[in-house]
């Protein structure tokens, strides 16, 4: 994406088709792509999965992850609930969100810091992202205590969403 | 939205008119809808209410709610700055979001564990939700625990928005 | 921008061009600008700088500044990963948005509340805005607890992000 | 028009709390930050710290350790309390109103309204 | 919080336009645009004569006015009359939501 300085005197997208209308039109940004899921209703491993038959449009899903079908840069945004039976001992609840089986950013919340044993201790924690994707990218989340998510009383509390807001064309 | 293939053979938004220029032009998403609202000075319910005299574009305010004038995919935030008073017992924040009337997503924090009396006790809650709305859709909040939400010391920092991703004509 | 009551019988975006496709064309929503830093490495105030070498795309960066160049609505966002050291007494953690040197918004969470010396505490707190911004307007954060902001363990978790939602030609 | 009267003892003796109260007058309490600064004889201002009216506290660090402020928004008074009090406290003690107003962004006015302040001598 | 670092006097002759500086640190003036100045005649309350750093309260005299750049602010008052005569303080909003004031600048009228 090159920004004019002038929408008057400059084409709207680079090269050199600025009187030619459809070459314009079709260099524009106007892809969209975005996904909204849900976690799935039984975790069973740290890598989450997700519901297949949430929101995708642009994207794909395939065992737990998401993959992007078209280059470009995607907000990523995840958000998870938890409920946490407090143990003797504080309990750190972290969420990373990978790319290409990376870590590329996590976000750490400690609960039950008290050391009592309360009847549960909810927590809610957030993470985005803003980054260059490529076609086959995959997006996946991570939980070490994936158990605390409770995925029976908040079934849509836990989330995974991206849109793209630039193409690369 | 359709997403093409390759910018180059297809037309950008679907149907027949590759060809016609003002008809792929008045197709492509445009439109653009949005708001940022924060929270009403005095709150006396569950339900909360907002200053209308904030940013609103394309979208209406109405008894406490948003109103869709557009439909399309939407993207809602909702961040919350709470203020405790601790009690003997720990206490539960809790954030809804609700369309038309439903609860789509919530948030909780439990605070206040420890089950001391401290002076005061911050927290900050968001979130955040991706999804395709109709016309006169309503979008509001509801917090149980209203009296939480000091907007005297904060009024700035408890807000609704939205914005339009990708309209669906 | 203006918002078409029908994609079919008015101009995409006012005025009188609405038969002048490169007019319409040109005046259509196309920019793009956002940005994506990472914090610095070695933070010594209260006003958090800036990884320059991130994402920067129609917007410059300048002594911890994000600088405005094109005019519209921008989201703004910001996350901050803190690893806390539990003093005798609870910690009070802010973080603020400012605009041109002016407190936009901000968000409070106290840690360490139960005031016993544990080991560490990990806290996750965001913060956004959506607003107008004209050229030249800065965007900064400012973190009291700045020490609290552990760069070496977290390098890639605290985050300033924006991108332009609608520009305003 | 508002106006704040300081109120409370003159004289305090080492290692005792200080206590003072401001009432305000012609006005509400409500929607304003209180504030305390004092003034040594020919010396500058030191702000002491401020409280709203929902509770919220912000002290002088160098202070925080002695210094409570508490707020009665049925009797239109704040209070400062100052404790184990040395000579170094003796001053001038002003009660003040700090206006600040969210609305796009958070303007700070300033301290717009004070008392006519109150002298403090700790003596034993 | 150290205390912001004013002249301890400044002078000058009726007619005259006078600058007082005030320099702090990137935690309160480098960081935010909420610099105040209160003036304060002998045996008197202080009154706030400047907010965010060029805004004059109503009733207060157009000669007074007020800027800032990096971390030092700066007061002017010019057309010197002798009433200006008085002790002049700048007071600074903080990353730690507190405030903090100058040492003080005695304004002398010749």
């Known amino acids: 994406d090159s920004i004019p300085n002038s929408p008057d005197n400059v084409p709207l997208k680079g090269g050199d088709c600025s009187e030619d209308l459809l070459c314009i039109l079709k260099r524009a940004p106007f892809k969209k792509s975005w996904a909204y899921l849900q976690v799935a209703k039984h975790l069973d491993k740290t890598k989450l999965s997700w519901n297949k038959d949430g929101i995708l449009h642009g994207v794909r899903y395939q065992d737990g992850n998401l993959v992007i079908q078209f280059p470009g840069l995607y907000f990523i945004i995840c958000q998870l609930q938890f409920l946490v039976q407090c143990p003797q001992n504080s309990v750190d609840l972290k969420l990373e969100l990978l790319i290409n089986k990376h870590i590329k950013k996590q976000a750490l919340v400690t609960v039950c810091e008290s050391g009592m044993q309360t009847k549960h201790v909810y927590q809610n924690l957030s993470q985005f992202l803003l980054d260059y994707l490529q076609v086959d990218t995959t997006i996946s989340v991570n939980v070490d205590t994936f158990q605390y998510i409770d995925t029976s009383t908040f079934p849509l509390e836990n989330v995974l969403s991206i849109f793209l807001y630039s193409n690369s064309d | 939205d359709s997403i093409p293939n390759s910018p180059d053979n297809v037309p950008l938004k679907g149907g027949d008119c590759s060809e016609d220029l003002l008809c792929i032009l008045k197709r492509a998403p445009f439109k653009k809808s949005w708001a940022y609202l924060q929270v009403a000075k005095h709150l006396d319910k569950t339900k909360l209410s907002w200053n209308k005299d904030g940013i609103l574009h394309g979208v209406r305010y109405q008894d406490g709610n948003l109103v869709i004038q557009f439909p399309g995919l939407y993207f809602i935030i909702c961040q919350l700055q709470f203020l405790v008073q601790c009690p003997q017992n720990s206490v539960d924040l809790k954030l809804e979001l609700l369309i038309n009337k439903h609860i789509k997503k919530q948030a909780l924090v439990t605070v206040c564990e420890s089950g001391m009396q401290t002076k005061h006790v911050y927290q900050n809650l968001s979130q955040f939700l991706l999804d395709y709305l109709q016309v006169d859709t309503t979008i509001s909040v509801n917090v149980d625990t209203f009296q939480y939400i000091d907007t005297s010391t904060f009024p700035l920092e408890n807000v609704l928005s939205i914005f339009l991703y990708s309209n669906s004509d | 921008d203006s918002i078409p009551n029908s994609p079919d019988n008015v101009p995409l975006k006012g005025g009188d061009c609405s038969e002048d496709l490169l007019c319409i064309l040109k005046r259509a929503p196309f920019k793009k600008s956002w940005a994506y830093l990472q914090v610095a490495k070695h933070l010594d105030k209260t006003k958090l700088s800036w990884n320059k070498d991130g994402i920067l795309h129609g917007v410059r960066y300048q002594d911890g500044n994000l600088v405005i160049q094109f005019p519209g609505l921008y989201f703004i966002i910001c996350q901050l990963q803190f690893l806390v050291q539990c003093p005798q007494n609870s910690v009070d953690l802010k973080l603020e948005l400012l605009i041109n040197k002016h407190i936009k918004k901000q968000a409070l969470v106290t840690v360490c509340e139960s005031g016993m010396q544990t080991k560490h505490v990990y806290q996750n707190l965001s913060q956004f805005l959506l607003d107008y911004l004209q050229v030249d307007t800065t965007i900064s954060v400012n973190v009291d607890t700045f020490q609290y902001i552990d760069t070496s363990t977290f390098p890639l978790e605290n985050v300033l992000s924006i991108f332009l939602y609608s520009n305003s030609d | 028009q508002v106006q704040l009267q300081e109120s409370g003892p003159g004289l305090v003796k080492p290692s005792e709390t200080l206590s003072l109260t401001c009432t305000v007058s012609?006005?509400?309490?409500?929607?304003?930050?209180w504030t305390w600064i004092r003034q040594p004889a020919g010396k500058g201002l030191e702000w002491i710290g401020r409280i709203y009216t929902s509770g919220i506290t912000n002290y002088n660090p160098s202070l925080k350790s002695r210094v409570t402020m508490s707020v009665d928004t049925s009797k239109n008074q704040f209070s400062l309390k100052l404790s184990s009090v040395t000579a170094a406290d003796t001053a001038v003690y002003y009660c003040?109103?700090?206006?600040?107003?969210?609305?796009?962004?958070?303007?700070?006015?300033?301290?717009?309204?004070w008392g006519q302040g109150t002298t403090v001598t700790v003596s034993s | 919080q150290s205390a912001l670092t004013q002249p301890a006097s400044v002078s000058g002759s009726p007619g005259q336009s006078i600058t007082i500086s005030c320099t702090g640190t990137?935690?309160?003036?480098?960081?935010?645009?909420?610099v105040s100045w209160y003036q304060q005649h002998p045996d008197r309350a202080p009154k706030l004569i400047i907010f965010?750093?060029?805004n004059r309260p109503s009733g207060v005299s157009y000669r007074f006015s007020g800027s800032n750049s990096g971390n030092t602010a700066s007061l002017t008052i010019s057309g010197l009359q002798a009433e200006d005569e008085a002790d002049y303080y700048c007071?600074?909003?903080?990353?730690?939501?507190?405030?903090?004031f100058g040492g003080g600048t005695k304004l002398t009228v010749l």
């Open positions: 012609g006005g509400s309490i409500s929607s304003y930050y």
């Open positions: 990137s935690s309160d003036i480098g960081l935010y645009d909420y």
């Open positions: 965010e750093v060029n």
């Open positions: 003040a109103r700090e206006r600040v107003v969210g609305a796009s962004r958070y303007y700070y006015y300033g301290v717009d309204v």
């Open positions: 007071s600074s909003y903080t990353s730690s939501s507190t405030w903090v």
